[in-house]
C-alpha cells in the first residue's frame, strides 16, 4: 500500500548533513544513526497525519510512534492505532479528531522496536500545523457597473482563517493577488467588461487562532467576463 504524503513547498531543506550523533563525554550513549524527523499536519482539525521518511532507514524498519500531551489531562502515553504505510513499511500515523488537542503541547516519539534506545522525541504546537480545506462555493456578484464582489465559504471557523485571492484576465501572464482577513469576501473595484477574469482563493489558519505557515489548496477557479456577461450580467455560476 502506497501512501501519498503531503510535503508542502517552502519547508524543506536538504542540509541535514550529519550521520553520527556525538554526545557529551559524560553520556553513556553510543553513536547511532539518527531517526527520521516526524512532520505533522492537522487537516481542517478533522484528522492529523504525522509522517516520516521511512526510506531514510538503512534497511526497511517498521518504526513505532507514541504520543502524548505535555502537562494536560491527556498526558498518558498513547500508541499509534492507525499507521500509514509506504511499501509495507510504517511511514506515518493518523490521529482522529478526538485525539487532537490544538492548544496543548503535542509530544511525539519515534522508536526503533529492534533497538529501543534508538528513539527521538519531538514537541509540536499543533495550532501552527493546521491546514484548512480549500475554500468552496465561490460566487461573484456585480455591485455596480464596474465593481465585482467575490464571496466564498470555508468548512471551518471563519474567524480563524486568513485568505489569499488571486485573479487575472485572459490577457495577463501572471496573477494579481490580494490578502483578505477573516471576512471571506473580496471586491474588485474596476472591472473591464471586455476581458474574461479568473478568480481563485486559498486559506490559512493564521493569525487569530494559530500561526500556521501552510496554505490550503487553491479553490476551484471561478470565471467572469466577456463570454458570459452578455447573457446575464447579474448571475454568475461556479465553473470548476
Amino acid at each position: 500500500l502506497n501512501t501519498t504524503i503531503l510535503t508542502p513547498n517552502g519547508n524543506e531543506d536538504t542540509t541535514a548533513d550529519f550521520f553520527l550523533t556525538t554526545m557529551p563525554t559524560d553520556s553513556l550513549s553510543v553513536s547511532t544513526l539518527p531517526l527520521p524527523e516526524v512532520q505533522c499536519f492537522v487537516f481542517n482539525v478533522e484528522y492529523m497525519n504525522c509522517t516520516w521518511n521511512s526510506s531514510s532507514e538503512p534497511q526497511p524498519t517498521n518504526l513505532t510512534l507514541h504520543y502524548w500531551y505535555k502537562n494536560s489531562d491527556n498526558d498518558k502515553v498513547q500508541k499509534c492505532s492507525h499507521y500509514l504505510f509506504s511499501e509495507e513499511i510504517t511511514s506515518g500515523c493518523q490521529l482522529q479528531k478526538k485525539e487532537i488537542h490544538l492548544y496543548q503541547t503535542f509530544v511525539v516519539q519515534l522508536q526503533d522496536p529492534r533497538e529501543p534506545r534508538r528513539q527521538a522525541t519531538q514537541m509540536l504546537k499543533l495550532q501552527n500545523l493546521v491546514i484548512p480545506w480549500a475554500p468552496e462555493n465561490l460566487t461573484l456578484h456585480k455591485l455596480s457597473e464596474s465593481q465585482l464582489e467575490l464571496n466564498w465559504n470555508n468548512r471551518f471557523l471563519n474567524h480563524c482563517l486568513e485568505h489569499l485571492v488571486q485573479y487575472r484576465t485572459d490577457w495577463d501572464h501572471s496573477w494579481t493577488e490580494q490578502s483578505v482577513d477573516y471576512r471571506h469576501k473580496f471586491s474588485l473595484p474596476s472591472v473591464d467588461g471586455q476581458k474574461r477574469y479568473t478568480f481563485r482563493v486559498r486559506s490559512r489558519f493564521n493569525p487569530l487562532c494559530g500561526s500556521a505557515q501552510h496554505w490550503s489548496e487553491w479553490s476551484h477557479p471561478i470565471h467572469w467576463g466577456s463570454n458570459t456577461s452578455k447573457e446575464n450580467p447579474f448571475l454568475f455560476a461556479l465553473e470548476a
Partner: nanobody, 126 residues
C-alpha cells in the same frame, strides 16, 4: 564540523539572573533545531529549552516563565536568559544543535542532537 562554545555561567545567589550564550562555528544555525540541556550531579541530563528553526520554543516545566530561549542567526548564536535562579538550577549547561529538514522540528531527546558544546557551570547558592 560544527563547534559550539558556551559562555556566561558562574556562581550567583538565588533570585539572580544569568545569560548563557552559545556561539557556533563551522555551519549556520539558521536551519538547526537547538537545545539547552543541563546535567546536575547524580541526575540524568534533561532538556531545559528547545527550539525549532521555525521559532517554536518549549521549556521544561520547572523553568517555564523564568528562562527564555532566543537566537540571533546573524551572529550564529543562541542564548538562554535565566531569571529568578534557584539552587536546584545548579548544573552544567550544554548547548546542542541538530540540522533539520523541517521548520517545526524541536527535539527534547538529547540523542537527537548531532553537535554539543563543552558545557558551562552554573551554581546557584541559597
Amino acid at each position: 564540523q560544527v563547534q559550539l562554545v558556551e559562555s556566561g555561567g558562574g556562581l550567583v545567589q538565588a533570585g539572580d539572573s544569568l545569560r548563557l550564550s552559545c556561539v557556533a562555528s563551522g555551519r549556520t544555525l539558521s536551519r538547526c533545531a537547538m537545545g539547552w540541556f543541563r546535567k546536575a550531579p547524580g541526575k540524568e541530563r534533561e532538556y531545559v529549552a528547545i527550539s525549532s528553526w521555525g521559532g517554536d520554543t518549549f521549556y521544561e516545566d520547572s523553568v517555564e516563565g523564568r528562562f527564555t530561549f532566543s537566537r540571533d542567526n546573524a551572529k550564529n548564536t543562541v542564548y538562554l536568559q535565566m531569571n529568578s535562579l534557584r539552587p536546584e538550577d545548579t548544573a552544567v549547561y550544554y548547548c546542542a544543535a541538530a540540522p533539520t529538514s523541517f521548520a517545526t522540528t524541536a527535539y527534547s531527546s538529547s540523542n537527537s542532537y548531532a553537535y554539543w558544546g563543552q558545557g558551562t557551570q552554573v551554581t546557584v547558592s541559597s
